[in-house]
Structures are given as structure tokens and as C-alpha cells.
């Protein structure tokens, strides 16, 4: 899916408002410095090309993102404002209903939840503090 | 563990050419910028070259420009550097290194590689 | 094209304060990065845009960056801080990054 045309300012607003919330609470009791960035974006479709990615992805040693309430919001805000978004996930949602696992928080979710808060972190700053 | 390995050094005659390349790993490789710096025997630190996350753009230092070739292969984690019309002033170490970028902007190098010795001698 | 001005030593005595400079014209209205070198080592990342600090790097390592100047400050100098240190901008005029010459940080 092609980001390019979502609406960045409202999609901004419901991280700040919501997601950013369920995010930092799945995170609870461990710092953001635990955990070296490891993935990055360059741009607002990037960015949300790559959280798209690590949150609806199943990795062999964290299948269960997708199930989480922050992403449950992710998918309704990209949904929300982005034109024809949610025709492009129909496929991968019932996919991923075949390959339900059991629901652990191991570190390495914990991992790729601490790179999600920073791509949504470079997501919501638009601009380098100087240019 | 993040890492990047620089290979492909060695000795090189004058005006020959040489490949060094570059293998990342430990991170999502496609999602960063990626540099080449070099460092002559005793000198400072001096880049080289730049491409772009998805290696779109590249940019050069005039002392290399029309002479070396940065590309990437996302698909297989590697950076690379082709070096043609080498001359003794490019007897250096070369590191490659990574940059998170925003749009244009290239930001700090977080990760280098251990470097890769190029000497061009006759 | 854009230069960077560091002196080529600092010296400090053990415990003590150095403060190395990096000298640009409105250098302030750049992000300034800061790299440690030791002998036969590749740089080390110690300070980006300005004045933020990786989290494996020691909070003795602070930076400043105003007017003409950026600054590395080191506090509590101690012998394993020797080693060469590099600012380093991005261009955005002419798409270049720029490092500075280096400075030679010895603790005496």
C-alpha cells in the first residue's frame, strides 16, 4: 500500500491521543534505552510503510503484535485516513487469523514495540530540529 | 548485535580499480542511509560518498566524483563501492557506517563498520 | 564549500573539564555530531544534534552549540577519554557531509 495520499495531521493526532498511550503501557517497566534502534524512516509514507510492517508482520519470535490493542487502533487509524487502505488489508487479516499463537510478551515483542514508539516518534516529528 | 563488515581492501596499482563492499546485519538495513568514510594514514576523517535508504540519490565528495560508484543491494543487506581510476591520494581505510535520514536531511552516523585498508601504490 | 575549524589539541588534567571546539559559520543553525576515534579503532557516535547523547555513551560527555560554535564537553576527564574527537554536519546546501580536521584530546 502506498501512503503517500493519508492524512498525516489526523493520523498524528489519534497516536497522540490513543495509540501512543496503549503503546507505552505494553511497554510498562522497561526503558526505551533497553533496546538499540534497529529499524528507521525517512519520511511520513515511510514511516508508516515500516510501523504498518512491524505491527501487522508476524516474525518467528513475535506473532501476536497484530492482536494488541494498540494495533487494533493502528489499523483503524490507517484506515480511517487513508484512502483504500482497508481494501488492501481484507486478504492479509484473514491470513493472519490462520496463524494465531498463543498470546506471550516476550523480550523480543518488547524489542519490536520499543521500535515501533520510535518510528511513530520520527512519524509525528516532521521536521529535524534544524535544517 | 548491529554490525557492519567492511571487505574488498588490498594493494592496487594507480588507475586500476578495486570493489569494496559492505554487509550489515543486526538491523533493518533498508531503512537507513548509508555512508562511506575514509581515513589516510595519520590524517582525519573524510567522506566519501552517500546513498539514500532506498538508494534513489546518492551524493559524492568532489574528490571522488566521476571516479567512485556507491550503490546498495536491500535485498541482500550489502553496500558497495566501486573505485575506478584510483590514484595514490586514495590510500586510506574506508568505513562504511549508517545514518537514520529524514526526507533530504542525512542525520548522525550511529554504527561503523572496523574499515577496510585500500592502498594504491605503483 | 562549508569548513568546520577544531584545534588540533586540548589537553586536560585528570578529573578536569575539557572542552573542545568546532568552529562553522552559523554553525548554530546546524546539527553538530561528535565521534571519538581511538588508535586503530573506527569512530564512535558520543554526541548528535547538538547536545544528544546515545544511551551507551557516559553522561560526562555533554554538548552546546551556538553563534559560530559547537562544543564537546567532557567532564571528569579521565585517561580512557583519550583519543581523537571529529565534529560533523550535513550540508543541506550542497547535499555534502563535512567533518572537522580533529582534535587530539590528551590527559596528562
Known amino acids: 500500500y502506498d501512503f503517500t495520499n493519508c492524512d498525516f495531521q489526523k493520523i498524528e493526532a489519534d497516536y497522540l491521543r490513543t495509540i501512543s498511550k496503549d503503546l507505552i503501557t505494553y511497554m510498562s517497566g522497561t526503558k526505551s534505552t533497553d533496546f538499540n534502534n534497529t529499524v528507521s524512516c525517512s519520511n511520513r509514507p515511510h514511516c508508516l510503510t515500516e510501523i504498518q510492517s512491524l505491527t501487522f508482520n508476524p516474525t518467528p519470535r513475535c506473532a501476536s503484535l497484530a492482536k494488541e490493542m494498540f494495533a487494533r487502533k493502528t489499523k483503524a487509524t490507517l484506515a480511517l485516513w487513508c484512502p483504500g487502505y482497508s481494501e488492501t488489508q481484507i486478504n492479509a487479516t484473514q491470513a493472519m487469523k490462520k496463524r494465531r499463537k498463543r498470546k506471550v510478551t516476550t523480550n523480543k515483542c518488547l524489542e519490536q514495540v520499543s521500535q515501533l514508539l520510535g518510528l511513530w516518534r520520527r512519524f509525528i516529528r516532521t521536521l529535524l530540529k534544524k535544517q | 548485535q548491529m554490525q557492519l563488515v567492511e571487505s574488498g581492501g588490498g594493494v592496487v596499482q594507480p588507475g586500476r580499480s578495486l570493489r569494496l563492499s559492505c554487509a550489515a546485519s543486526?538491523?533493518?538495513?533498508?531503512?537507513?542511509?548509508m555512508h562511506w568514510v575514509r581515513q589516510a594514514p595519520g590524517k582525519g576523517l573524510e567522506w566519501v560518498a552517500v546513498?539514500?535508504?532506498?538508494?534513489?540519490?546518492?551524493h559524492y565528495a568532489d574528490s571522488v566524483k566521476g571516479r567512485f560508484t556507491i550503490t546498495r543491494d536491500n535485498s541482500k543487506n550489502t553496500l558497495n563501492l566501486q573505485m575506478n581510476s584510483l590514484r595514490a591520494e586514495d590510500t586510506a581505510v574506508y568505513y562504511c557506517?549508517?545514518?537514520?535520514?529524514?526526507?533530504?536531511?542525512?542525520?548522525?552516523?550511529?554504527?561503523w563498520g572496523q574499515g577496510t585498508m585500500v592502498t594504491v601504490s605503483s | 564549500s562549508y569548513v568546520l575549524t577544531q584545534p588540533p589539541s586540548v589537553s586536560v588534567a585528570p578529573g578536569q573539564t575539557a572542552r573542545i571546539t568546532c568552529g562553522g559559520n552559523n554553525i548554530g543553525s546546524k546539527s553538530v555530531h561528535w565521534y571519538q576515534q581511538k588508535p586503530g579503532q573506527a569512530p564512535v557516535l558520543v554526541v548528535y544534534?547538538?547536545?544528544d547523547r546515545p544511551s551507551w555513551i557516559p553522561e560526562r560527555f555533554s554538548g552546546s552549540n551556538s553563534g559560530n560554535t559547537a562544543t564537546l564537553t567532557i567532564s571528569r576527564g579521565e585517561a580512557g577519554d583519550e583519543a581523537d574527537y571529529y565534529c560533523?554536519?550535513?550540508?543541506?546546501?550542497?547535499?555534502?557531509?563535512?567533518f572537522g580536521g580533529g582534535t587530539k584530546l590528551t590527559v596528562l
Open positions: 543486526g538491523f533493518t538495513f533498508r531503512t537507513y542511509g
Open positions: 546513498v539514500w535508504y532506498d538508494g534513489s540519490y546518492t
Open positions: 560533523q554536519i550535513w550540508d543541506s546546501s550542497s547535499s555534502l557531509v563535512v
Open positions: 557506517a549508517r545514518s537514520p535520514q529524514w526526507e533530504e536531511i542525512f542525520e548522525a552516523m550511529d554504527i
Open positions: 544534534d547538538d547536545s
